[in-house]
């Protein structure tokens, strides 16, 4: 979702979304100078009227967020960026038509990794989104994403791995041998949109085995 | 203790309309994917339709959309499915379901529901 | 949609004996699939998840494993109350498919 460029003031408009938090940002082209300043503007697709971003008017910063605007992520909007440097005609560039849902990538998940003696547990927590419900509260991922999983992998040498996979948020890694290190990674799935996040990485130690010390 | 329990099957007449509900208790109703799936005589199983109870993001099997709707009144904690323009092939055992820590592992004991002149 | 192709539709099996039953996926689905036991007149009863993981208070004679785009459902020993028709299910994308049953009778 970038345009095109065919001026020296304003290029690679596009956003850039992440957990549904949707960022407006752009580049200065070659004519552009520090005295260059951007006016940020959005709206709805199938609406004729443009609406001016309070906060992102004549800035000099290159990025503009737009999360709460474009918080409905069943709809599709365009946001158009305005370059105006001294003693020159203002430049307007446009984005591609933005759709959160389809567009915004899946951050790690948030993990919780807990050793034991001969297990280590993996605790995802749920992964609060800017969008809201009817009623006025966060949404998480799992809320949006019917089709979202995690896949868990527990790396106990170069060679053997061990798998998990579920929408589940508790999940245990069993048969571990005691005192010895582990490599585990978590990941977010969601194979309709093709979504895949990159994996949550912790290196977590297993418990000592103290058993024999009350025989 | 989790339970779902399904009412409002009974026999309709092709192109006629059913509301089934399914009234929910034993967990947090207002925050879960709750299911209709259903099962003709002799027949298997088939997911008919999804609903989150919080973002109130629906899915549809392609041979209902347009005709069913489903939804939710979490005030009630109730899920429905309205059922519109029925034809002989919705005939069925029609269960609620909902997904607890992942799993779809609570299902309502069922409601008939046939279509037939 | 995803295609669950399951088999066999149906088996005899005297109590005692190991049973499989297999599902194939038209496509992958990594180890989203679930395994059901349904008795007449009764709702489905989740026996296995993520492939081979074992629903809490489901005997150990049931298991699961995957290779592949192909699961497996083995009972180790048959007993009469296992007797009832076997479902695999997709949970990987929607709309979640069934495959279409095997019916375990006795010989």
């Known amino acids: 979702h970038t345009t095109v460029d065919t001026s020296g003031l304003l290029q690679h408009v596009k956003f850039q979304s992440s957990n549904f938090e949707n960022i407006l940002t752009w580049d200065g082209g070659p004519a552009s100078t520090s005295d260059t300043v951007y006016s940020v503007e959005y709206k709805k697709y199938g609406e004729r009227k443009w609406l001016a971003k309070a906060g992102c008017q004549r800035i000099t910063q290159k990025f503009c967020n737009l999360t709460m605007e474009t918080r409905n992520h069943t709809e599709f909007y365009y946001a158009k960026v305005t370059a105006v440097s001294a003693g020159g005609p203002p430049v307007t560039k446009m984005t591609d038509r933005f759709s959160s849902l389809q567009h915004t990538t899946i951050k790690p998940p948030d993990v919780t990794c807990i050793p034991k003696v001969r297990s280590i547990q993996m605790l995802v927590h749920p992964t609060l989104t800017p969008v809201l419900s009817e009623d006025g509260h966060q949404l998480t991922l799992e809320e949006i994403f019917h089709d979202l999983f995690y896949r868990l992998e527990l790396h106990v040498n170069h060679t053997y791995q061990m798998h998990l996979e579920g929408k589940q948020r508790e999940y245990e890694f069993l048969g571990l041998t005691p005192d010895t290190e582990f490599l585990g990674s978590i990941t977010i799935l969601t194979p309709i949109l093709s979504k895949e996040s990159a994996p949550y990485v912790c290196r977590v130690k297993t418990l000592p085995d103290r058993t024999w010390a009350y025989s | 203790e989790v339970q779902l329990v399904e009412s409002g099957g009974g026999l309709v007449q092709p192109g006629g309309s059913l509301r089934l509900s399914c009234a929910a208790s034993?967990?947090?109703?207002?925050?879960?994917?709750m299911y209709w799936v259903r099962q003709a005589p002799g027949k298997g199983l088939e997911f008919v339709s999804v609903?989150?109870?919080?973002?109130?993001?629906?899915h549809y099997v392609e041979s209902v959309k347009g005709r069913f709707t489903i939804s939710t009144d979490n005030a009630k904690n109730t899920l429905f499915l309205q059922m519109n323009s029925l034809k002989s092939e919705d005939t069925a055992v029609y269960y609620c379901?909902?997904?607890?820590?992942?799993?779809?592992?609570?299902w309502g004991q069922g409601t008939q529901v046939t279509v037939s002149s | 949609d995803i295609q669950m192709t399951q088999s066999p539709s149906s088996l005899s099996a005297s109590l005692g004996d190991r049973v499989t039953i297999t599902c194939q996926a038209s496509?992958?689905?990594?180890?989203?699939l679930a395994w059901y036991q349904q008795k007449p007149g009764q709702a489905p009863n989740l026996l296995i998840y993520?492939?081979?993981r074992l629903q809490t208070g489901v005997p150990s004679r049931f298991s699961g494993s995957r290779s592949g785009t192909s699961f497996t459902l083995t009972i180790s020993g048959v007993e009469a109350e296992d007797l009832a028709t076997y479902y695999c299910?997709?949970?990987?994308?929607?709309?979640?498919?069934f495959g279409q049953g095997t019916k375990v009778e006795l010989k």
């Open positions: 034993g967990f947090t109703f207002s925050s879960s994917w």
């Open positions: 496509q992958s689905i990594s180890s989203m």
């Open positions: 993520g492939a081979s």
């Open positions: 299910l997709q949970d990987y994308s929607w709309p979640l498919t």
């Open positions: 379901a909902t997904r607890i820590q992942g799993l779809i592992d609570y």
């Open positions: 609903i989150n109870t919080r973002s109130g993001i629906t």
